[in-house]
Interface confidence: low
Amino acid sequence: RRGAPAEDQDCGRLPDFIAKLTNNTHQHVFDDLSGSVSLSWVGDSTGVILVLTTFQVPLVIVSFGQSKLYRSEDYGKNFKDITNLINNTFIRTEFGMAIGPENSGKVILTAEVSGGSRGGRVFRSSDFAKNFVQTDLPFHPLTQMMYSPQNSDYLLALSTENGLWVSKNFGEKWEEIHKAVCLAKWGPNNIIFFTTHVNGSCKADLGALELWRTSDLGKTFKTIGVKIYSFGLGGRFLFASVMADKDTTRRIHVSTDQGDTWSMAQLPSVGQEQFYSILAANEDMVFMHVDEPGDTGFGTIFTSDDRGIVYSKSLDRHLYTTTGGETDFTNVTSLRGVYITSTLSEDNSIQSMITFDQGGRWEHLRKPENSKCDATAKNKNECSLHIHASYSISQKLNVPMAPLSEPNAVGIVIAHGSVGDAISVMVPDVYISDDGGYSWAKMLEGPHYYTILDSGGIIVAIEHSNRPINVIKFSTDEGQCWQSYVFTQEPIYFTGLASEPGARSMNISIWGFTESFITRQWVSYTVDFKDILERNCEEDDYTTWLAHSTDPGDYKDGCILGYKEQFLRLRKSSVCQNGRDYVVAKQPSVCPCSLEDFLCDFGYFRPENASECVEQPELKGHELEFCLYGKEEHLTTNGYRKIPGDKCQGGMNPAREVKDLKKKCTSNFLNPTKQNSKSNS
């Protein structure tokens, strides 16, 4: 299906590519000696990049700092020093550059202020950093300013005094709407959710916090939860972990109406040393990790129903180190329903698993064609691919990048990996899949940085090396053939690749520095591939591809979550521009239903290797510890519930007698006496 990758051999060299790239390579040398550089894209497809360089000299008592701000509006080809727009002020890098949502063009930089000042200082821009306004704050910010996703003029911030401050006019004026706030988040429709401590402090009151909501930017408030440990938002779900009455355990509660009503999630409770983590969430469902008791480094993944209440066990022994620690859980955005993660086996080896149906079934990644099993494999002919992700990076393995996929580069997944029975500590190679993870091929020998340009029309890579580099590699056929281009005669210490988020651009910026005996100078090289992909792609450049196809003879081939999708994909042999306005062309068609399209409802489970849902024996004749909307009520079910996002029609309908499950609400989480509405007068 795909040949082994090659570099400059057995591959048609693109005509005149060196001349074309040389004419489109732009160098920019930054005239400062800064120790660190941070880069932000402002807006989508605007070409505007802000670069903040910082230089800190630690002195005995204070540290003297200097910042420089640069702006490009041509995707990094040219930069202009605009430090004067921020009055040559030192910018606090821990707050980063707060870039507004969508294409608002808004930017906030938080400045360093002297010790005795009344409040902090920010520089605000609403025209894509063409101009900045200095604003002195009535508080010292603890967190970066957070924009409301719905209205970029609305900002919230926490102060060092734990005050919740809100601005309605893009930071020009601020109002403290609440004190003693531990965590605040924007929800939908400009709603703010936040937890407050009642007695001592956020840390001391953990598990005794209150969850509040304001829908009018602080005019009025409603207490929507008590005895809160923490809360989170995912998709259309609001989650809260709530302390139990009797002991120190806590449980997850979920709301789909911004906290007006709550249901207890059918998930195990956790103790003090354990944690819950929302791995991924969309409008349909949520992946939830529940930590195992003890310091095991693993837990269980559960997938939810459409209400976020009923959970099915999805994957055991899921690697997740500690709270806020490392997990390899990766959403493969280039193909619907695909996720990759790692499990920790009994012998403490780490193995990669992939699901193609949103967590319904997990399997090992197929061994790449023409690859040999490494030393971790017991059987030298049978093994699988194991992917390096966050955990490997945290362990300082020679892995410069996590797996990469882009929604508009359909089917493409690029990752570092090794072939064997488990992840290897040996130097990894780079592998690519062009079908969303079903099949894999070695793309590059040894570790590399990589990025996708022009919706998959070009893949760019740079070797990971501790020596200065001056070569960039690129492929126009999804990683099969590679060309090398010397982008500078003077090699640089490489620090990163930067391309516009969204993989639609044809520009790549190579960042690094040159070092002489006394000075280090930052430099960027921006390479524009527009002349490599000389013409716009036409109809004949695309071919149809059925996603998730594993058995072309079967009428259900390609059916995942009740429907199949046929895509128009660029032929590997076509060297042309998808272009910035490229929209993925897909043709969905509905599949007939089968039992695979349903999960087991509350009180039911699927015995191993069975497709039917059967009643859980331990629940027969018992009152269930289950609380729907915080009220005692009857739950009726036929034992099956359509998988969230499943679009199947007709076919098999698992009809059976509807059972009435009498159950008792054991959660006093929403004790009505605790639900207050307050006004901020």
Epitope: T46, N103, G105, F128
Partner: antibody
């Protein structure tokens, strides 16, 4: 202050060429693109093309391809627009205009456009036999 | 190329009244649209960029709206100095193109 000053009026015969200059001041010349726009008597505005003063790269409207040449001199912060093979219908006022987002004039543009924010006073070119 | 169509060609309005000018693109230009004002014998002056953002120094009575193919310039209360020709211009795809203009005259 930011301003663009253009050269004086010209009278030309059909078939001749004209070269109009536009001197920029009050800002960093190489940081902004420059568009050329013309307006025939009693008519609307017509975009002719754009130049990037930093690298000198250009993009011309199809209608003027082959007849128009835009150049720049960074030492004097001046851009030039030369139009050859003049015809009577080229009689118009020619404007240079600073175009901050001109990068995309040759292809799909950025999703945000700043507009042509500073204009020259215009140069009248009359083509008559 | 993208064709920009402005309507009406002429708009007669009394001072103090509201004026609404329309601009339609032959295909989507996203928000890559600018509005200009031109008075006789003068160069055009930028009023609105990014479809809705007022340029520096432009009074608040001028506002722009729209996205995609339909755009509107509104002058909430016409002053004597507002009587002029108004042009819209797209910058989504090269070549940049202007509308034919709307002349706002005193009623």
């Amino acid at each position: 202050q930011v301003q663009l000053v253009q050269s004086g009026a010209e009278v030309k015969k059909p078939g001749a060429s004209v070269k109009v200059s536009c001197k920029a001041s009050g800002y960093t010349f190489t940081s902004y693109y420059m568009s050329w726009v013309r307006q025939a008597p009693g008519q609307g505005l017509e975009w002719m093309g754009i130049i990037n003063p930093s690298g000198g790269s250009t993009s011309y409207a199809q209608k003027f391809q082959g007849r128009v040449t835009m150049t720049r001199d960074t030492s004097t912060s001046t851009v030039y627009m030369e139009l050859s093979s003049l015809r009577s219908e080229d009689t118009a006022v020619y404007y240079c205009a600073r175009d901050p987002s001109g990068i995309a004039a040759a292809g799909p543009a950025s999703r945000y456009y700043y507009g042509m924010d500073v204009w020259g006073q215009g140069t009248t070119v009359t083509v008559s036999s | 190329e993208i064709v920009m169509t402005q309507s009406p060609a002429t708009l007669s309005v009394s001072p103090g009244e509201r004026a609404t000018l329309s601009c339609r693109a032959s295909q989507s230009v996203s928000s890559n649209l600018a509005w200009y004002q031109q008075k006789p014998g003068q160069a055009p002056r930028l009023l609105i960029y990014g479809a809705s953002t007022r340029a520096t120094g432009i009074p608040a009575r001028f506002s722009g709206s729209g996205s995609g193919t339909e755009f509107t310039l509104t002058i909430s209360s016409l002053q004597s100095e507002d009587f002029a020709v108004y042009y819209c211009q797209q910058a989504r795809l090269g070549p940049w193109t202007f509308g034919g203009g709307t002349k706002v005259e005193i009623k």
